[in-house]
Interface confidence: low
C-alpha cells in the first residue's frame, strides 16, 4: 500500500494530508509544507519532515557543539529546500539570502555568505553518534539486553537494517548508539540514518511522528528506558569548512 | 494487488541442490523484503529466511550454510537455493511479502510448490 | 531461538460457539510498547492467511468475530461466534527477533 487503505493516513509520517486520489483510487499521502507525494511504507525524509514542521513553527532549539569535526545541530529549526527527491539540496538559504552548505542530515558544515557561496556537492553523513542520558534505575541495564533492545528498535520501529548499528556503548548512565552508513552501502530502499536518527530524536522527545502509534515506550527487559538528555552528533564523509574564528 | 508464485523443480535428488523461483507481480519488488517459509507434509510452518530491501539476507540458523536467498530485481522475481538436501527437505515452500510497514510479519503469501527430495 | 507453544492441539467447537486458542512464548515478544504476536489461518491445499497482527489488529478484510489479545509471553485468538467456513489450523507467530518462529498449529473442526 501507499498509505493505510482503510481510512486513508500515512502511517509513517503524521505531517500529511491524505486522500484516495492516487491511481486506481488508491490513497495517496502528500507531505505538509512541501506537497510532495510520499511512500508511507518508510520512512520520510528528514528534508521533507522539517519543512513540514515549519508549516506549523514551534520554538527552535540549541544543541551543544562538542569537537572539530563531530557536528551537531545548533541551528535549530529552519524551511529547507528539498530536492525532487526529498533530499536537502546542498545549498540553503533564508529569506534574507543569507546562505551556507549543509550535510545530507541538513546540519550546516560551513560558515554562512552570501547568494554567491557555492555548495558543489551534498556531502554524505556517514557516520552518526546518538547520545543518550538515561534517568536512574534500581540498577544499571544489561549492556546485552539493552544492545538488543535498540538494535531491534533501529530494525523493527525505524526499519533500519541491522548492519547499520555499527555499535552500542553502555557507560550507566550514558548510552552511545552508533550509526554508520557509507554512500557505497546504501542500497535502494535502504532507510537512510540521518532519516532513521531524526524519527528516533522525536520519538525520544515525545513527539512521535508516527500515525496513530503510541509514543515509544522504550523497556529493556520489563525495566522502562527513560531518556533525560539527547545529543546527536554527525560526523560527514568530507570533513566541514569552517573558519578558525569558529573553531576557536 | 500483489501475487507472488514460486515455481521451480517437483523432484530433487539427495544432495543435490533446490533451486526455486519466487515471481512478484501487481507491484515493485525494490520496496519490500521477501520471505521464504517451507511445511513438510501434514507439519507446521519453518521460516528458512528473508532478503530484505538492501539486498542483505538473514537465514534461520539451522539452515545456515546451505541456504542463500537472491534477487533479480531487473525480473521481479526472487531465488531460493538450498543444498546438500535430504528427504527432511521435502516440503511445500512457500515466499511471502514482509508486510507494510506497521505489521512487521509476512501479509501477502505465495501458493506455495511442492518439493520432493528422492532418488 | 524463540519456542512457540499452542494450546490444545485441537479443537472441536459448535457453530456459533466460541473457540479460544492460546500460544505461549519461551521469552517475552513485546517491548517498546508492542507486542510482536501474529496468527494465521491455513485452510487445506492453501497458504497461510494472515488474520491479526501485533497481537491484537485484525489484518484488513477478516471478519471481526476474529481478535487477538495478551503480551509478554501469553497471548490468544478468540472466534467469537464458530462459523463453517473457520474450520482451518491456526499458527501464531512472532517477530520478536531472527529467526521467526511459529507454533505448532492449533487444528480446528465443528463439533
Known amino acids: 500500500h501507499t498509505a493505510a487503505q482503510d481510512n486513508c493516513t500515512c502511517p509513517t509520517n503524521k505531517m500529511t494530508v491524505c486522500s484516495p486520489d492516487g491511481p486506481g483510487g488508491r490513497c495517496q499521502c502528500r507531505a505538509l509544507g512541501s506537497g510532495m507525494a510520499v511512500d508511507c511504507s518508510t520512512l520520510t525524509s528528514k528534508c521533507l519532515l522539517l519543512k513540514a514542521r515549519m508549516s506549523a513553527p514551534k520554538n527552535a532549539r540549541t544543541l551543544v557543539r562538542p569537537s572539530e569535526h563531530a557536528l551537531v545541530d545548533n541551528d535549530g529549526l529552519y524551511d529547507p529546500d528539498c530536492d525532487p527527491e526529498g533530499r536537502f539540496k546542498a545549498r540553503q538559504c533564508n529569506q534574507t539570502s543569507v546562505c551556507w552548505c549543509v550535510n545530507s542530515v541538513g546540519v550546516r558544515r560551513t560558515d554562512k555568505g552570501d547568494l554567491s557561496l557555492r555548495c558543489d556537492e551534498l556531502v554524505r553523513t556517514h557516520h552518526i553518534l546518538i547520545d543518550l542520558r538515561h534517568r536512574p534505575t534500581a540498577g544499571a541495564f544489561n549492556h546485552s539486553d539493552l544492545d538488543a533492545e535498540l538494535r531491534r528498535l533501529f530494525r523493527e520501529r525505524y526499519r533500519l537494517h541491522p548492519k547499520f548499528v555499527a555499535a552500542v556503548h553502555y557507560e550507566q548512565p550514558t548510552i552511545q548508539i552508533e550509526l554508520r552508513q557509507n554512500t557505497s552501502q546504501k542500497a535502494a530502499g535502504d532507510v537512510d540514518i540521518g532519516d532513521a536518527a531524526y524519527y528516533f530524536e522525536r520519538d525520544i522527545k515525545g513527539e512521535s511522528l508516527f500515525q496513530g502509534r503510541g509514543g515509544l515506550d522504550l523497556r529493556v527487559r520489563g525495566e522502562p528506558l527513560q531518556v533525560e538528555r539527547t545529543l546527536i552528533y554527525y560526523l560527514d564523509e568530507i570533513p566541514p569548512k569552517f573558519s578558525m574564528k569558529r573553531l576557536t | 494487488q500483489v501475487q507472488l508464485q514460486e515455481s521451480g523443480p517437483g523432484l530433487v535428488k539427495p544432495s543435490e541442490t533446490l533451486s526455486l523461483t519466487c515471481t512478484v507481480s501487481g507491484g515493485s519488488i525494490s520496496s519490500y523484503g521477501v520471505h521464504w517459509i517451507r511445511q513438510p507434509p501434514g507439519k507446521g510452518l519453518e521460516w528458512i529466511g528473508v532478503?530484505?530491501?538492501?539486498?542483505?539476507?538473514d537465514y534461520n540458523s539451522a539452515l545456515m550454510g546451505r541456504v542463500t536467498i537472491s534477487v533479480d530485481t531487473s525480473k521481479n522475481q526472487f531465488s531460493l537455493k538450498l543444498s546438500s538436501v535430504t528427504a527432511a527437505d521435502t516440503a511445500v515452500y512457500y515466499c511471502?511479502?514482509?508486510?507494510?510497514?506497521?505489521?512487521?510479519?509476512?501479509?501477502?503469501w505465495g501458493q506455495g510448490t511442492l518439493v520432493t527430495v528422492s532418488s | 531461538d524463540i519456542v512457540m507453544t499452542q494450546s490444545p492441539d485441537s479443537l472441536a467447537v459448535s457453530l456459533g460457539e466460541r473457540a479460544t486458542i492460546n500460544c505461549r512464548a519461551s521469552k517475552s515478544v513485546s517491548t517498546s510498547g508492542y507486542s510482536y504476536m501474529h496468527w494465521y489461518q491455513q485452510k487445506p491445499g492453501q497458504p497461510p492467511k494472515l488474520l491479526i497482527y501485533?497481537?491484537?489488529n485484525l489484518e484488513s478484510g477478516v471478519p471481526d468475530r476474529f481478535s487477538g489479545s495478551g503480551s509478554g509471553t501469553d497471548f490468544t485468538l478468540t472466534i467469537s461466534s464458530l462459523q463453517a467456513e473457520d474450520v482451518a489450523v491456526y499458527y501464531c507467530?512472532?517477530?520478536?527477533?531472527?529467526?521467526?518462529?511459529f507454533g505448532q498449529g492449533t487444528k480446528l473442526e465443528i463439533k
Open positions: 507467530q512472532h517477530s520478536r527477533e531472527l529467526p521467526y518462529t
Open positions: 532478503i530484505w530491501t538492501s539486498g542483505v539476507t
Open positions: 511471502a511479502r514482509d508486510a507494510d510497514y506497521d505489521r512487521y510479519t509476512m501479509d501477502y
Open positions: 501485533l497481537a491484537s
